[in-house]
């Protein structure tokens, strides 16, 4: 049962991840206008992976695409790379995780490829995770540069009686969408490896135990599970299930609906 | 049509208060920055602060913190400016006026004139 | 805050000729973000409140006459009227919209020669 609970957790958590994943990607506040002391500004400059925009304060707001592809700094395309990367390593976590939960039967499905199945999502979804978290950490640290060298250059003035302001950016909402999105997906992964582990049919190797018949002796073996599935054989502690017996599998518990904010 | 009507001209004496209304119509009276401009004789026009009408959340020129408190009735479509210590030098035409795209105001009271005097 | 100059304070021009007013900010007006100017244009008659002309420093607000055009960028900028009519006869204000307080041009009165 604690199995079948890992393995459902791990995939809502990485859904849920996954989800925050493609929000932060889409979004346009990855880098914000930095308001110093003033909270109220009369222009306030926001920019994503894919637009920038511009908000003021009579309400209009005005977004423009990035067109250009080679124009763009080798940073923001590098991180646009690692959020889809992330995107897609996560979105097939997903779909072979669908297929590797315990609670849904497909077929004659055996459980070594259920569990093969669960270890390859949960290896995706730790990659997922991982990119995204990367791709948000380079943005932040690309934001973290520019900020101090905007601040050092704050005012550029033009024979002492001009002042042009530089706009400072910030982090924006999305970056911390993306780490938590990261951290979440990195966290389910990891639930699902362990579920793996314990869906793992391993080898039995129980020692002989002989029975002196008169006359001659007979070595009987009990059987075990079918196959190893090469995760390591644990001779302590192992138990012996009825190969028929699947008590886990007759009661089936379906996902539940989260709303993603 | 758009229109901003504001409350007629005002004599005060020097110390007390006044309170200027702006009826707006026309238009989502929650959906704009209401702002307001004083233009006192022979000087350029001054930004006193600004009053959104959905959130009530103000911003005041820092010239003006302490001297004008402005306030609204949401129901009246209605944006009220109270004047505080009047002096002689708060002698000036008062105006509202609603911000649009560019942050420009595209509609303005009629004015209100304040005189104080002794 | 940024302030904001008119010259020449008065001009005076002949009917149907060009008119022209300049504005100068003591900062950029020019926004990155969007390369606009946030750059505003009003036209004052006795008696009446400003009338919005032109914002963006150079998008001519609708209804306003196309002699009216508006030009510059950064901290320079230029309110030409192209042919001037009897009842442009008023004082023009140049105002910053770019960040708070909004101030204003001290303006420029003109007049018929």
């Known amino acids: 049962m604690a199995v079948t609970a890992c393995q459902g957790l791990g995939f809502v958590v990485s859904l849920i991840g996954i989800a925050g994943i493609i929000a932060a990607t889409c979004m346009d506040q990855w880098s914000t206008q930095d308001l110093y002391n003033n909270p109220v500004t009369a222009v306030f400059n926001y920019q994503g992976l894919w637009r920038s925009c511009v908000r003021e304060s009579s309400g209009f707001t005005e977004c423009r695409g990035y067109f250009t592809l080679l124009g763009l700094p080798a940073m923001l395309q590098a991180v646009r790379a690692l959020m889809i990367v992330g995107i897609v390593l996560g979105a097939i976590g997903l779909l072979v995780s669908i297929f590797a939960l315990k609670c849904i039967r497909i077929g004659s499905m055996e459980d070594s490829a259920k569990a093969n199945m669960t270890l390859t999502s949960g290896i995706m979804f730790i990659v997922s995770g991982l990119c995204a978290i990367a791709g948000v950490s380079v943005f932040a640290n690309m934001l973290v540069t520019n900020f101090w060298m905007s601040t050092a250059n704050m005012y550029t003035g033009m024979g002492g009686m001009v002042q042009t302001v530089q706009t400072r950016y910030t982090f924006g909402a999305a970056l911390f969408v993306g780490w938590v999105a990261g951290g979440l997906t990195l966290i389910g992964g990891v639930m699902m490896c362990i579920a793996c582990r314990g869906l793992a049919p391993e080898e039995t190797n129980y020692k002989a135990v002989s029975y002196h018949a008169s006359g001659h002796s007979v070595a009987y073996k009990p059987g075990g599970f079918k196959a190893s599935t090469g995760f390591g054989s644990n001779t302590k502690n192992k138990k012996i299930y009825d190969g028929g017996a699947r008590t886990e599998d007759e009661v089936q518990s379906y996902p539940s609906k989260h709303d993603y904010v | 049509e758009v229109q901003l009507v504001q409350s007629g001209a005002e004599v005060k004496k020097p110390g007390a208060s006044v309170k200027v209304s702006c009826k707006a119509s026309g238009y989502t009276f929650t959906s704009y920055w209401m702002h307001w401009v004083r233009q006192a004789p022979g000087q350029r026009l001054e930004w006193i602060g600004m009053i959104h009408p959905n959130s009530g959340s103000t911003n005041y020129n820092e010239k003006f913190k302490g001297k004008a408190t402005l306030t609204l009735d949401k129901s009246a479509s209605t944006a009220y400016m109270e004047l505080s210590s009047l002096r002689s030098e708060d002698t000036a035409v008062y105006y509202c006026?609603?911000?649009?795209?560019?942050?420009?105001?595209?509609?303005w009271g009629q004015g209100t004139t304040v005189t104080v005097s002794s | 805050d940024i302030v904001m100059t008119q010259s020449p304070d008065s001009l005076a021009v002949s009917l149907g000729e060009r008119a022209t007013i300049n504005c100068k900010s003591s900062?950029?007006?020019?926004?990155?973000?969007?390369?606009?100017?946030?750059l505003t244009w009003y036209q004052q008659k006795p008696g009446q409140p400003p009338k919005l002309l032109i914002y963006w420093a150079s998008t001519r607000e609708s209804g306003v006459p196309d002699r009216f055009s508006g030009s510059g960028s950064g901290t320079d900028f230029t309110l030409t009227i192209s042919s001037l009519q009897a009842e442009d006869v008023a004082v023009y204000y140049c105002q910053n919209a770019y960040t708070y307080p909004f101030t204003f041009g001290q303006g420029t009165k003109l007049e018929i020669k």
């Open positions: 900062q950029s007006l020019l926004n990155s973000g969007n390369q606009k100017n946030y």
């Open positions: 006026a609603r911000l649009k795209t560019g942050n420009s105001f595209d509609y």
